[in-house]
């Protein structure tokens, strides 16, 4: 039994780091393998993650962490019974993938303005709480070409757009994702999408 693709890990910078790797053949990850992880720090203890299958030879492990600070560094040991298959390290702050925003809501009752709001996925005491920026994707269910991205570079989790920038009388969907420049993170997954019917009063033409 050998590791074909070494584990790579990303952290949500809150409580979970996810490591993925591939073995050289079909493997029952949960029964055959264990990933041990330990903070490089005084009095820290090794903790065990039981991996799950992720395709035939692929494994994924969700490492539970109480919290993360920028200096944290973990040792990782991948075991198959008594055999050490791979040894490595992982610094969560250098491999951050933020949590996806939630509770995306479209408010359509604000005088021809669409107000989109969502929730910051982090609690106020987490470092990322005040460092997230967002991308909002709006698209038409009827017209695949009607697809747009709005970059929200301010901290408030909301976006206002004129309803007239979208076509009237058709349904749209929106979703939002986050990233943090401070840690040069990857983008989060997209939030679940939300749907609304876009309608607004056309301005009267004056002759």
């Amino acid at each position: 039994m050998k590791v074909l693709q070494e584990p790579t890990c990303v952290s949500d910078y809150m409580s979970i780091s996810t490591c993925e790797w591939k073995m050289n053949g079909p493997t029952n990850c949960s029964t055959e393998l264990r990933l041990l992880y330990q903070l490089v720090f005084l009095l820290s203890e090794a903790h065990t993650c039981i991996p799950e299958n992720n395709g035939g030879a692929g494994c994924v492990c969700h490492l539970l962490m109480d919290d993360v600070v920028s200096a944290d560094n973990y040792t990782l040991d991948l075991w198959a019974g008594q055999q050490l298959l791979w040894k490595g390290s992982f610094k969560p702050s250098e491999h951050v993938k933020p949590r996806a925003p939630g509770n995306l809501t479209v408010h359509t009752n604000v005088s021809d303005t669409l107000l989109l709001t969502w929730s910051n996925p982090y609690p106020p005491d987490n470092y990322l709480y005040n460092h997230l920026t967002y991308a909002v994707n709006i698209w038409s269910e009827n017209d695949p070409a009607d697809f747009r991205i709005y970059n929200v570079t301010y901290l408030e989790p909301s976006l206002r757009i004129a309803a007239s920038t979208l076509k009237s009388g058709i349904s749209y969907r929106a979703r939002v994702r986050a990233w943090a420049q401070c840690y040069n993170t990857t983008w989060s997954e997209w939030s679940p999408s939300t749907k609304w019917h876009n309608s607004y009063r056309e301005p009267f033409e004056q002759h």
Epitope: E45, L63, M65, A71
Partner: antibody, heavy 122, light 107 residues
């Protein structure tokens, strides 16, 4: 409710021995590391020893190394401090304290006992 | 060993006052700084860990801050029950070491 109750303190002559106990309740004792900390009369706190949940990591302060031994019995939810070759400077209130061995290891001694008094005097 | 220097060693303040206690480490302790309260009967309780994190059940009038070698504990609105001795402790390196304590009294 987390409870730590120390016992075994008392008056002992220099060179003598004493064994302190700390009975734990209200939490899963075998999941936690444990410390002993002492406080000499009218003085500050001094760390004495640490033992992890499975007894595989044990550390003692230089001031007590070779004389004091920390141990634990997880089946009986009890922490011990065996003290030998006692000196007058070991006179202190001895506290046991719980240490969460959580992943991030950022946590301190989060619950302390009420202490047991040790007096070393001829 | 890391030396922890706590100031002042004693402090007299009035109820409702804002009180600050300082703690200096002899080397960088990377925010592994905890604060404990010892009541006159000897009872020791954790207040704040990792510089600024409030232990469960501790009133929000207690707060902590600092970095590197310099740290502080602030009680924003002093109450009668806060009469105690306060100790800082570094958790960065063994042996763990404590400050000398600050005895807080009411004027």
């Amino acid at each position: 409710e987390v409870q730590l109750v120390e016992s075994g303190g008392g008056l002992v002559k220099p060179g003598g021995s004493l064994k302190l106990s700390c009975a734990a309740s209200g939490f899963t004792f075998s999941d936690y590391g444990m410390h002993w900390v002492r406080q000499a009369p009218e003085k500050g706190l001094e760390w004495v020893a640490y033992i992890n949940s499975g007894s595989s990591k044990i550390y003692h302060a230089d001031t007590v190394k070779g004389r004091f031994t920390i141990s634990r019995d997880n089946a009986k939810n009890t922490l011990f401090l065996q003290m030998t070759s006692l000196r007058s400077e070991d006179t202190a209130m001895y506290y046991c304290a719980r240490f969460p061995t959580v992943v991030a290891a950022r946590y301190p001694m989060d619950y302390w006992g009420q202490g047991t008094s040790v007096t070393v005097s001829s | 060993d890391i030396q922890m220097t706590q100031t002042p060693s004693s402090l007299s303040a009035s109820l409702g006052d804002r009180v600050t206690i300082s703690c200096r480490a002899s080397q960088d302790i990377s925010n592994y700084l905890n604060w404990y309260q010892q009541k006159p009967d000897g009872t020791v309780k954790l207040l704040i860990y990792f510089t600024s994190r409030l232990h469960s059940g501790v009133p929000s009038r207690f707060s902590g801050g600092g970095s590197g070698t310099d740290y502080s504990l602030t009680i924003s609105n002093l109450e009668q029950e806060d009469i105690a001795t306060y100790f800082c402790q570094q958790g960065n390196t063994l042996p763990y070491t404590f400050g000398g304590g600050t005895k807080l009294e009411i004027k």
